[in-house]
């Protein structure tokens, strides 16, 4: 599998690793959004990681209200984080925007 | 780095690998798009090589109908591909839903 | 201490649109938290009618959607919202609320509730 | 939707009284249960949300428990400023939906 397909397979089956553990298999809880932020993304938690810190993310996340998030809500997410890490790719000296 | 944060990485190079070849360098123009699309994900485009096939994949990227492909579309994108994978990954038998 | 202030036109006739203001004070308006219109037909209980949040995402009461805009401004730390088509049905006192970003999404700072009649 | 019926509708007690208000789901909500207070031309207040967990600046003798479609909000003695009008409301999924209310009265 070529590099882009691998990181759509690491997308789907992290969350599954974390969203069957507990409740709807299907969506992720609280506290498995938590181990997932934890574990998986620790340079997006960074020093956040009090109890309201994680419920902001959660409840940022939560679009339909339910207090989980699916998968595509988790979609949504891991998106914006994207979005952040090509806005700092982007704006490196070295990528300045250049005639082509 | 962790394999989520891997697959971030890998998301936002790939999109600039292909989006610094020609024109505005921060978005995918056809022929790029193309090119992505052929090298980096061809599980998805299958035998769905002709001209009318990519022009539709364009068309449905491009929501802001400017004829590129800019980085938050592509995010969409890949977010529906995964949408698509997790509906299988889901729809296996070995992962049908369980009382847990 | 989170306040919030209810505005807009206490009379309505059938027919038009009722439009209602929210202004926020005591905390900045942030996408932290989600902001609820929530009504009371008189001597009767509380009805939800929708809410605007976290990238502007909205979600309205199935039974008032196609009736229903809400919006916010954060500039001037207010949300709104319209309903249109209005009939006495509608006649309740209308109240803004924060909703917390804690386990089940309370509602907890509310407005003091401003009566909105419909009536020719 | 998910329907919350409370009982009772209305009672009558003193103060000092062990007052019990109940609330019951027609699904399971998963504990994402709150009760609120509504005094005549006064905004309403958060007692208590997730079913147990008490709002900053309540008072200790408001207490909530339950599990599943059934709860329950207990004032364990009761004062003369608690006399007032209690809502239960689900925080499960949308839309969100409230109990009809409790109406504490003095005997």
């Known amino acids: 599998a070529r590099p882009l397909e691998e990181a759509l397979d690491v997308i789907v089956s992290t969350f599954h690793k974390y969203s069957g553990k507990e409740g709807d298999k299907f969506k992720l809880n609280k506290t498995e959004l938590k181990e997932l932020l934890t574990r998986e993304l620790p340079s997006f938690l960074g020093k956040r990681t009090d109890e309201a810190a994680f419920q902001k993310v959660m409840s940022n996340l939560d679009s339909n209200r339910d207090n989980e998030v699916d998968f595509q809500e988790y979609c949504v997410f891991l998106s914006c984080i994207a979005m952040m890490c090509n806005e700092f790719f982007e704006g490196c000296p070295d990528k300045e925007p250049r005639k082509k | 780095a962790r394999p989520l944060e891997e697959a971030l990485d890998v998301i936002v190079s790939t999109f600039h690998k292909y989006s610094g070849k020609e024109g505005d360098k921060f978005k995918l123009n056809k022929t790029e798009l193309k090119e992505l699309l052929t090298r980096e994900l061809p599980s998805f485009l299958g035998k769905r090589t002709d001209e009318a096939a990519f022009q539709k994949v364009m068309s449905n990227l491009d929501s802001n109908r400017d004829n590129e492909v800019d980085f938050q579309e592509y995010c969409v994108f890949l977010s529906c591909i995964a949408m698509m994978c997790n509906e299988f990954f889901e729809g296996c038998p070995d992962k049908e839903p369980r009382k847990k | 201490q989170v306040q919030l202030q209810e505005s807009g036109p206490g009379l309505v006739k059938p027919s038009q649109t009722l439009s209602l203001t929210c202004t926020v004070s005591?905390?900045?308006?942030?996408?932290?938290?989600?902001w609820n219109w929530i009504r009371q037909h008189p001597g009767k209980g509380l009805e939800w009618i929708g809410h605007i949040g976290y990238g502007g995402n909205i979600n309205y009461n199935p039974s008032l959607k196609n009736r229903l805009s809400m919006s916010r401004d954060t500039s001037k730390n207010q949300f709104s919202l319209k309903l249109s088509s209005v009939t006495a049905a509608d006649t309740a006192v209308y109240y803004c609320t924060r909703e917390s970003f804690y386990d089940g999404y309370p509602f907890d700072y509310w407005g003091q509730g401003t009566l909105v009649t419909v009536s020719s | 939707d998910i329907q919350m019926t409370q009982s009772p509708s209305s009672l009558s007690a003193s103060v000092g009284d062990r007052v019990t208000i109940t609330c019951r789901a027609s699904?399971?909500?998963?504990?994402?249960l709150n009760w609120y207070q509504q005094k005549p031309g006064k905004a309403l207040k958060l007692l208590l949300y997730y079913t147990s967990r008490l709002h900053s600046g309540v008072p200790s003798r408001f207490s909530g428990s339950g599990s599943g479609t059934d709860y329950t909000l207990t004032i364990s003695s009761l004062q003369p400023e608690d006399f007032a009008t209690y809502y239960c409301?689900?925080?499960?999924?949308?839309?969100?939906?409230f109990g009809g209310g409790t109406k504490v009265e003095i005997k």
């Open positions: 005591g905390d900045s308006f942030t996408n932290d938290y989600y």
């Open positions: 699904q399971d909500i998963r504990n994402y």
């Open positions: 409301q689900q925080g499960n999924s949308l839309p969100r939906t």
